[in-house]
Amino acid sequence: ELCDDDPPEIPHATFKAMAYKEGTMLNCECKRGFRRIKSGSLYMLCTGNSSHSSWDNQCQCTSSATRNTTKQVTPQPEEQKERKTTEMQSPMQPVDQASLPGHCREPPPWENEATERIYHFVVGQMVYYQCVQGYRALHRGPAESVCKMTHGKTRWTQPQLICTGEMETSQFPGEEKPQASPEGRPESETSCLVTTTDFQIQTEMAATMETSIFTTEYQ
């Protein structure tokens, strides 16, 4: 089931999924001056079977001025600069996200894609937060949020993160150990079934990460 909304916004922080659950949708959007090819897909969809997950459909952009050029190539470094990131790009590669059953890795860029990626997450998806450059993380608990189904409605848990305006940057997913396990987080509704998945596996995976490229910015 798709989550009703985006993860919560934390001032001066960005969120990022390490891997995307099957059912996740990604908008195929193009930057200004470009548009989707005629009859091109509006979305990519993470699909799969028991052994392998991958993104269905391809996003393709073409110049708004010309109708006959279609390109789908990895952008040059100068083109990639246009994508919004937190400037903490590291040569270190993330853990192999394909090793997480039922999940897709981050789709590769497509030429002339929009400056920001728009994902539609599903129940059970976990995202991780990090303070933007120039802000320091103060943790009261896990700097993550998970989309849960409660009483037939979806909601995101509140990440326990405050970003203070100090000049030192913190490591991802947090320089301090979380004070509470994800399961120990207080819930507003305890009288009904709560559907959660992937806490353990995603938390372990995140612990192996030192840095990550973020493409979602706090607005």
């Epitope: 909304d5 009859s39 897909s41 509006l42 969809l45 929009a114 400056t115 728009i118």
Partner: antibody, heavy 115, light 108 residues
Framework: QVQLVQSGAEVKKPGSSVKVSCKAS????????INWVRQAPGQGLEWMGR????????DYAQRFQGRVTITADKFTNTAYMELSSLRSEDTAVYYC????????WGQGTLVTVSS | EIVLTQSPGTLSLSPGERATLSCRAS???????LAWYQQKPGQAPRLLIY???SRATGIPDRFSGSGSGTDFTLTISRLEPEDFAVYYC?????????FGGGTKVEIK
């Protein structure tokens, strides 16, 4: 709970323009597509176009291209649809809807074009 | 553009009966990006099904969607009095988004 509240009914003369607003509250606005769909009296639903507020780029149905302008203000969580060169056939209820599969809809705005 | 054709145009049934509505696409709807809506007079459409088979929040389980490619079906297992309305299918696989012409489910 997500709510989309649209501006009130309008009566317009042929050749003029109308601008309908759609204010969102209670959920994600700037990162999800806002679509505009119209329904003429006794007819079906017709998609006009969409915008993703955070990107500010709109996408229009071919038949409305050049006559419709969709904009959004992500600070006030409001989307706008302006239709120009109005004719009597544009008399319809105009709806805004969040996401491309319309998970939430505005209540509709009746636009009557009459001389 | 993808043209959606709904059938029948009108379905006359009694409460308690099963309703089967069809939506056929002129070309394949990728990844089953198809939605179903219910609309009652004077009201905005209400999302019932997205992704061809996923029920929207708060929709009773008597509503179910199925199909892929070019043929999709909305089934109402046991019609309740409040289910008599017009039903639309819509694809969001590619732009322009398109709707079917609608099926009116009326009381027999």
């Amino acid at each position: 709970q997500v709510q989309l509240v649209q501006s009130g009914a309008e009566v317009k003369k042929p050749g003029s323009s109308v601008k309908v607003s759609c204010k969102a509250s209670g959920g994600t606005f700037s990162r999800y597509p806002i679509n505009w769909v119209r329904q003429a009296p006794g007819q079906g639903l017709e998609w006009m176009g969409r915008i993703i507020p955070i990107l500010g780029i709109a996408d229009y149905a071919q038949r409305f291209q050049g006559r419709v302008t969709i904009t959004a203000d992500k600070f006030t969580n409001t989307a706008y649809m302006e239709l120009s060169s109005l004719r009597s056939e544009d008399t319809a209820v105009y709806y805004c809807a969040r996401r491309d599969w319309g998970d939430y809809w505005g209540q509709g705005t009746l636009v009557t074009v009459s001389s | 553009e993808i043209v959606l054709t709904q059938s029948p145009g009108t379905l006359s049934l009694s409460p308690g009966e099963r309703a089967t509505l069809s939506c056929r696409a002129s070309q394949s709807v990728s990844s089953s990006f198809l939605a179903w809506y219910q609309q009652k007079p004077g009201q905005a459409p209400r999302l019932l099904i997205y992704g061809a088979s996923s029920r929207a929040t708060g929709i009773p389980d008597r509503f179910s969607g199925s199909g892929s490619g070019t043929d999709f079906t909305l089934t109402i297992s046991r019609l309740e009095p409040e289910d008599f309305a017009v039903y639309y299918c819509q694809q969001y696989s590619s732009s322009p988004l398109t709707f079917g012409g609608g099926t009116k489910v009326e009381i027999k």
